[in-house]
């Protein structure tokens, strides 16, 4: 069976939107009005992995681009990157480990934990216009909570 996907946007707990910053980076900033059209639309695919009631494995691609968020070690540190893939082969049910995130729902908020690096989360800074990154702390200064807005295909 083909992998199930949906289109969505994400905003962090401070209501910052995610936009492209150069070809291989996302940044978070507050957008209003027509500027909201700049925000990236994700293609969230429901992939193979360990699943529970509040934890669902997903891959996060950028709609209409052959780019996926992935988590790799760079200089011995878990790092979030945008990785290009062959569009003929993605998305797929069995994604490589680095592409998989555990979507965790708590109190109507979403967290995205790296499946490859447990306890590391997609994060944004309090400051405006800063890169989206993989952070190793929850409940600190950096933001790990998001809300999801469905986008019609």
């Amino acid at each position: 069976a083909p992998v199930r996907s949906l289109h969505c946007t994400l905003r962090d707990a401070q209501l910052k939107s995610l936009v492209m910053s150069g070809p291989y980076e996302l940044k978070a900033l507050h957008l209003q009005g027509q500027d909201l059209e700049q925000q990236v639309v994700f293609s969230m695919s429901f992939v193979q992995g360990e699943e529970s009631n509040d934890k669902i494995p997903v891959a996060l691609g950028l709609k209409a681009k052959n780019l996926y968020l992935s988590c790799v070690l760079k200089d011995d540190k878990p790092t979030l990157q945008l990785e290009s893939v062959d569009p003929k082969n993605y998305p797929k049910k069995k994604m490589e480990k680095r592409f998989v995130f555990n979507k965790i729902e708590i109190n109507n908020k979403l967290e995205f934990e790296s499946a490859q690096f447990p306890n590391w989360y997609i994060s944004t800074s309090q400051a405006e216009n800063m890169p989206v990154f993989l952070g190793g702390t929850r409940g600190g200064q950096d933001i790990t909570d998001f809300t999801m807005q469905f986008v019609s295909s």
């Epitope: 193979q48 992995g49 360990e50 790799v72 070690l73 990785e83 290009s84 893939v85 062959d86 082969n89 069995k94 490589e96 480990k97 680095r98 499946a115 490859q116 690096f117 447990p118």
Partner: antibody, heavy 120, light 107 residues
Framework: EVQLVESGGGSVQPGGSLRLSCAFS??????????VGWIRQAPGKGLEWVSH???????SYNPSLKGRFTISKDTSRNTVYLQMNSLRAEDTASYFC????????????WGQGTTVTVSS | DIQMTQSPSTLSASVGDRVTITCRAS??????LSWYQQKPGKAPKLLIY???KLHSGVPSRFSGSGSGAEFTLTISSLQPEDFATYFC?????????FGQGTKLEIK
Amino acid sequence: EVQLVESGGGSVQPGGSLRLSCAFSGFSLSTSGMGVGWIRQAPGKGLEWVSHIWWDGDESYNPSLKGRFTISKDTSRNTVYLQMNSLRAEDTASYFCARNRYDPPWFVDWGQGTTVTVSS
Amino acid sequence: DIQMTQSPSTLSASVGDRVTITCRASQDISNYLSWYQQKPGKAPKLLIYYTSKLHSGVPSRFSGSGSGAEFTLTISSLQPEDFATYFCLQGKMLPWTFGQGTKLEIK
């Protein structure tokens, strides 16, 4: 010091089954990011990746095997298994287990290999 | 599947020579490439990972370079113990695939 030791190889007729074991020491397969893979080498040929298992139980297989092999682990025994069913002559090879950490993979430590011969 | 093609299949060289082995991928594999050395009857040994990072304990005469779909392993000055077969491995996409190998033999 990391060590991996394969066992369970031998001769079997086409259609038969074998279970290979990879006993390891010097690392734990409950450590996040850790993985063990099976790689085989037919006589005089190159290397072919067969299967892989991560610390969290996530498994991957080479689709060329068409579902005949199953990988599993016993974390408490520090052992990874490869159950091979419906064996064919083309499965004749040395089977190595090897350790990696994280994806993308590179295999840091290898066992010495165990030989599987499928012949009537 | 991603096909990995190594060239040459066999390479004859002498001690002290500088040699280069090439690995080509059938599509872009980023820098997700590793190199292994194997001697007859032995298990492979990791030399290089992430295209250019030298595995601990590997002599500095070994180096790796490349990106995208073309990669090279270079041995700057061949030593007697370097005569072996060399394999590349791509880790970009499952199934992970090896090159067919390059046998480095004494001229």
